[in-house]
């Protein structure tokens, strides 16, 4: 293993994660570790001199940057909150506040928005689609012979109770928002008025 700074012919350093090619001197030099920046650029005889990032700044990766990145607070206005503070080798870790979810752009969570759960009213249910989503729910009426009696984003319409299966008779018919009401059949020989 060569120790930086060292000469190389094809401008490709042995350890590209931790070394970089310095064209001015035609040598491979050390990168600075996370949490540090380049205080003095390497020469043919001396390797890179690194220094710890100043307070409230960071570098997350092995680098040959002349400065550190400024730490940023988590942005409340965009719906974020802090999970872990900024350190010299890591920016502040932010997440969406409770009841909020990420809006992504190029795989990055750019802001958070409130999860708006559409409540399907009694007599309706959420239309089943292939996508499992909490937003943009489309509520559709219960099919004949079915009911749904809550305001809910996920409740399904249930079939009306069939009184005869239970040995009962119908007292009141079911609707789209209420079940059939059953009652005991009249006693044999009871007078029907």
């Amino acid at each position: 293993q060569l120790v930086p700074p060292y000469r190389i012919e094809n401008q490709t350093c042995w350890d590209q994660d931790k070394e970089y090619y310095e064209p001015m001197h035609d040598v491979c030099c050390s990168r600075c570790p996370p949490g540090e920046f380049v205080f003095a650029v390497c020469s043919r005889s001396q390797d890179t001199v690194c220094k710890t990032c100043p307070h409230n700044s960071y570098n997350e990766h092995w680098n040959h940057l002349s400065t550190c990145q400024l730490c940023r607070p988590c942005d409340i206005v965009l719906g974020f909150e802090e999970v872990a503070p900024c350190t010299s080798d890591r920016k502040a870790e932010c997440r969406c506040q409770p009841g909020m979810s990420c809006v992504y752009l190029d795989n990055e969570c750019v802001h958070c928005e409130e999860e708006r759960l559409v409540l399907c009213q009694p007599g309706t249910e959420a239309e089943v689609t292939d996508e499992i989503m909490d937003t943009d729910v489309n509520c559709v009426p219960c099919k004949p012979g079915h009911f749904q009696n809550t305001s809910s984003p996920r409740a399904r319409c249930q079939p009306h109770t069939r009184c005869e299966i239970q040995g009962l008779v119908e007292a009141a018919p079911g609707t789209s928002y209420s079940d059939t009401i059953c009652k005991n059949p009249p006693e044999p020989g009871a007078m029907l008025l």
Epitope: N56, L70, C71, R72, P73, C74, D75, I76, V77, G79, E81, E82, P85, C86, A92, Q97, P98, G99, M100, C112, E114
Partner: antibody, heavy 120, light 106 residues
Framework: EVQLQQYGAELGKPGTSVKLSCKVS????????IHWVIQRPGKGLEWIGR????????ICTEKFKNKATLTADLSSNTAYMQLSQLKSDDTAIYFC?????????????WGQGTLVTVSS | DIQMTQSPSQLSASVGDRVTLSCKAS??????LNWYQQKLGEAPRLLIY???ILQTGIPSRFSGSGSGTDYTLTISSLQPEDAATYFC????????FGSGTKLEMK
Amino acid sequence: EVQLQQYGAELGKPGTSVKLSCKVSGYNIGNTYIHWVIQRPGKGLEWIGRIDPTNGNTICTEKFKNKATLTADLSSNTAYMQLSQLKSDDTAIYFCAPTTLTTPDSFAYWGQGTLVTVSS
Amino acid sequence: DIQMTQSPSQLSASVGDRVTLSCKASQNIYKYLNWYQQKLGEAPRLLIYSTNILQTGIPSRFSGSGSGTDYTLTISSLQPEDAATYFCQKYYSGFTFGSGTKLEMK
């Protein structure tokens, strides 16, 4: 110690613009968001918007989108708010306040406020 | 938008009284609430953040509590210098201030 300096008063004529400044000392505004708050005479506090001084990105409430323009200058550690098309109901005190790394969710530091009076 | 309602709008109390100020959100704000004190001609001053954490330098007679939509600022023993207007501020999904409660001395 974090300190915010605002000019005490500005006078503007209806239809013109004023530019308010907020100079921060004791803290790098690159580590903050700078927020602006309005207080009309005898009334409560109302959040106007904020700027990210590192990239100039701003967010303002709908009410102030066409009224307030927020800018910042990292080199002088100063934030600005320009109020355009002044009307009499823009007469108010305007405060600046940063959210910082240690206080990301509250306004622990405030400028003393600039009183803007709109009068012909 | 989430609305913040404070009550009462005005309150008169005597030195030594225990005073309770109320702040109500139009929906759950998950304890994401701050309290500020503002005296005439001054900028607001942060008293309590995150519902119940006392800001450095604020007297211990001030305390905060609440959850969901209902929050309270309590002054355990009112002092003459507490005469001011008090604002709550939610920081859930952005910043919004309450309308304020003006506290006067009897």
